[in-house]
């Protein structure tokens, strides 16, 4: 569903997008993800902030918690206990890193309509969750884990060694949160709540990144974060499991690390409970091309966890790193020993495999020159997954169902023909036993969320169709979008081109390349967006292009692993190649070509500007990496190896932005960074600026005081206004 295009009769009522539209979020869309609480019931927070329970079978709805109760403690979030006797209410949200935050929690007793008094929770809490059955509570406070059998009970302290920036229990440290798990929690209840598993991260030997936070005080604060950069000492991780029924009986029991992993530096990558007495742990060598999946069983006699070598499954990559961005997680079948998992097949495409005994004997479930992306749910007779198979567009996502009860297994695309023009990029959310599911379509048309019967796939109702957005866009001249591919030297380069509303192939337009280009990323996706680049095309008449080159995902290992140990080479080459092809199309003004990117995209845009091709007149780098020696170990080493002489130090040195300072002389460069960036440290831009000054190269720069990697709030408005002025000046467009 795209708003109707311009007809001559309407032309004077139609208007272009404005920058204000974008900054105000005028054309943002809504999605609807049910908070499933059973096979047929879900919760949803209504527009007026009531918590409403919906029963799909009967069509009835029930307000289980009024907005009055929510407001009484300023709650912005909630969580119903599985026995439906209590609700936690979350307030005083205080963001920390990407996922982590602290909050104050209140427990509301649904049986008497009052808040639980006595043995209240401490504040602020770092993480809190209900057990999967009943109403036990686990929470993390000051880096230690606590357990309550019932909300009104006194807490049982599970760990005692938690210390800020030193020992983290039940929550990840910075690098595990951002690059490995990636979640705000590191504790996992067993399916019926008998056991609680948790990770302990020891950061005592990790070097600390320190930066100033200016605030309003006379003296700036210093933020200290244990942050392992490439080659530095890493966190030491241990996994423990405690019996929550009798927590004091034997205490936490450590789960052994597989011998082949423990022989050198390693990571823990995920934990999956199979049953109450069987758990699956995934481990990864520091050189991230070997992953081990270890299935462990509870020994009642010894009260310990046993991980036999016969239940270790090794996943190894010979051409790159293990997995895609992360090593995939197993989805266990009902027999509680076999599982489904996505990994590379012999042709180098990520596909679903069924592992019963050994990885070598894995049965391949999907195959083809496309990739399986996510396994949503396995039931007794069906497996639901997403892939980009349909019509061979890698930037699409459709949901499929494979029948696993019958032989041969039959495959059905659930979404391919539902709303074919409007919807080509889906995700799904399933109720218990996949009795029902919600589909969330992200585009290319206006997003829509729908509810479906899990047996027949029949649509039951529309959950959110963004009618207001559709109406608001009726008089807007949106740019045209096309997704196509270039074939260059046996490489397929998919691109998205965003064209001005009255695009005319016989005219010449300025071109802006928007790049991310990081390993296992994808920019060319069939999704809806009205954003800054939509405005640049609609109002300012620019052509914008996004190109997925080597190193990007979901098109096979050949493209993905091409950048292994060589970051900053092929990603840049492929952007340049695409620009040359765009020029050949005849509608690009070759004297007005720019490139911009954020984060990894800032790195690529900087290298492209400094490539010496003369293609780019100007460009912008927002919060760029400038040297891989400055970035996090887990991410960087996955793709680059170690910065040591006997490993890959040479390419670490060759791939810096600073090494190309001289080449910025003939381009207009705008460098932007937040001073409180915990992720890509301000250090990166400081070093670029220093190198440019030392080379006596002129450039423009903007810093955002006390802003992190997201440059949010008022900084966002300033940022996009500033970048707009820069580009309009570069392209000689009148203000």
């Amino acid at each position: 569903l795209r708003p109707s295009r311009v007809h001559n009769s309407e032309e004077n009522t139609m208007r272009a997008l404005t920058l204000k539209d974008i900054l105000n979020g005028t054309f943002s869309y809504k999605t609807f993800f049910p908070n499933w609480i059973s096979g047929q019931e879900y919760l949803h927070q209504s527009a007026d902030n009531n918590i409403v329970l919906y029963n799909i079978e009967t069509g009835q709805s029930y307000t289980i918690l009024s907005n009055r109760t929510m407001k009484s403690v300023n709650a912005s979030n909630y969580g119903l206990s599985p026995d439906r006797q209590f609700v936690y209410l979350e307030s005083d949200y205080s963001k920390l890193w990407r996922y982590s935050y602290t909050a104050t929690y209140y427990i509301y007793d649904l049986s008497n309509g009052e808040f639980v008094r006595g043995n209240e929770l401490p504040r602020p809490i770092q993480y809190l969750c209900w057990s999967p059955v009943g109403s036990k509570l686990a929470y993390v406070y000051q880096n230690n884990i606590y357990l309550k059998q019932r909300p009104g009970d006194p807490p049982f302290q599970i760990t005692f060694n938690g210390r800020e920036n030193k020992i983290f229990n039940g929550i990840p440290d910075w690098v595990y949160e951002e690059e490995m798990l990636p979640t705000k929690y590191a504790l996992w209840w067993s399916p019926n709540g008998k056991f609680l598993a948790y990770a302990e991260f020891n950061d005592k030997d990790i070097p600390v990144i320190a930066y100033s936070y200016y605030g309003d005080e006379q003296y700036p604060r210093t933020i200290n974060i244990p942050y392992p950069k490439a080659g530095a000492k890493n966190p030491v991780v241990r996994i423990f499991i405690i019996d929550t029924t009798y927590p004091a009986y034997v205490g936490p029991q450590e789960v052994p690390v597989p011998a082949m992993i423990a022989s050198s530096d390693y990571y823990f990558s995920w934990l999956t409970w199979v049953t109450d007495e069987r758990v699956c742990l995934q481990w990864l060598k520091r050189v991230q091309n070997v992953s081990v999946l270890s299935i462990c069983d509870f020994r009642e006699d010894w009260q310990t966890w046993d991980c036999p070598k016969t239940q270790e499954h090794i996943e190894e990559s010979r051409t790159g790193w293990a997995g895609g961005f992360f090593v995939s997680r197993p989805v266990f079948s009902y027999d509680a020993i076999s599982y489904y998992k996505i990994f590379s097949d012999k042709d180098g495409y990520k596909h679903i495999h069924y592992i019963k005994d050994t990885v070598e004997n894995a049965i391949q479930i999907t195959s083809g020159k496309w990739e399986a992306i996510n396994i949503f749910r396995v039931t007794q007779d069906s497996l639901f997954y997403s892939s980009n198979e349909f019509e061979e567009y890698p930037g699409r996502r459709n949901i499929y169902r494979i029948s696993i009860g019958s032989y041969p297994p039959s495959k059905k695309c659930v979404t391919c023909h539902l709303r074919k023009e409007r919807c080509q990029y889906y995700t799904a959310s399933f109720s218990d036993y996949a009795k029902y599911y919600a589909l969330v379509c992200y585009g290319p048309g206006i997003p829509i969320s729908t509810l479906h019967d899990g047996r027949t796939d029949q649509e039951i109702k529309i959950l959110e169709e963004n009618k207001e957005l559709e109406n608001a866009l009726k008089n807007i001249q949106l740019p045209k979008e096309e997704i196509k591919k270039l074939e260059v030297d046996e490489i397929t380069l998919w691109y998205k081109m965003i064209l001005p509303p009255q695009f005319d192939r016989s005219k010449k337009y300025p071109l802006l390349i928007q790049v991310y280009g990081g390993p296992c990323s994808q920019s060319v996706r069939s999704v809806f967006a009205v954003n800054w680049i939509s405005y640049l095309a609609s109002k300012e008449g620019m052509v914008i292009a996004l190109v997925d080159g080597r190193g990007t995902a979901f098109q096979g290992d050949k493209l993905l692993y091409a950048v292994y140990r060589k970051l900053g080479v092929y990603e840049v080459e492929d952007q340049i190649t695409a620009v040359r092809k765009f020029i050949e199309m005849g509608f690009i003004d070759e004297k007005r070509i720019a490139i911009w990117g954020w984060s990894y995209g800032g790195y690529v845009s900087s290298l492209a500007l400094a490539s010496g091709t003369g293609l780019f007149k100007c460009g912008i780098a927002v919060a760029p990496v400038s040297s891989w020696e400055y970035y996090a170990s887990v991410y960087t080493e996955r793709f680059m190896g170690l910065p040591t002489k006997d490993d890959n130090l040479e390419h670490y040195k060759n791939s810096t932005v600073m090494a190309r300072a001289e080449y910025f002389r003939n381009v207009d460069y705008l460098l932007i960074h937040g001073t409180a960036d915990d992720n890509v440290h301000f250090q990166n831009s400081a070093q670029i600026a220093k190198a440019l000054v030392n080379a006596q190269v002129d450039f423009q720069a903007m810093w955002y005081s006390d802003q992190n990697h997201g440059l949010s709030g008022l900084s966002t408005n300033h940022l996009y206004t500033h970048m707009t002025h820069f580009l309009k000046q570069c392209f000689s467009l009148s203000d």
């Epitope: 059973s38 019931e41 029930y62 119903l80 439906r84 006797q85 649904l110 049986s111 309509g113």
Partner: nanobody, 123 residues
Framework: QVQLQESGGGLVEAEGSLRLSCAAS????????MGWFRQAPGKERELVAA???????LYADSVKGRFTISRDNAKNTVYLQMNSLKPEDTAVYYC?????????????????WGQGTQVTVSS
């Protein structure tokens, strides 16, 4: 084991009122959550109202403000006062019980049931 017996159903005109009663056997009545369900011909049995052991109530949005559930633990009885009745309220009304929380709307979560009482609202 709880035995339940409904009464108070009948024929009533639109906008009229009825009061349903459900008498329960068993000494631990006070510890059970109690609910009223209804089933119209060809439709699923749906929860109309529920009351927890602590007296907290839950209503279907379609009856909120018109129906009131209450309990008398001394008499082992739960009531459903139905006002401003509409033709679409016509159904067999069932009393149900469960140990634990009241905030369950699926039929399968309520193990104990009465025989039902017919309520007919004429227009």
């Amino acid at each position: 084991q709880v035995q339940l017996q409904e009464s108070g159903g009948g024929l009533v005109e639109a906008e009229g009122s009825l009061r349903l009663s459900c008498a329960a056997s068993g000494r631990t009545f006070g510890s059970y959550a109690m609910g009223w369900f209804r089933q119209a011909p060809g439709k699923e049995r749906e929860l109309v109202a529920a009351i927890s052991s602590g007296g907290s109530t839950l209503y279907a949005d379609s009856v909120k403000g018109r129906f009131t559930i209450s309990r008398d633990n001394a008499k082992n009885t739960v009531y459903l006062q139905m006002n401003s009745l509409k033709p679409e309220d016509t159904a067999v009304y069932y009393c149900a019980a469960r140990s634990g929380g009241a905030y369950y709307t699926a039929r399968v979560d309520w193990p104990y049931w009465g025989q039902g009482t017919q309520v007919t609202v004429s227009s």
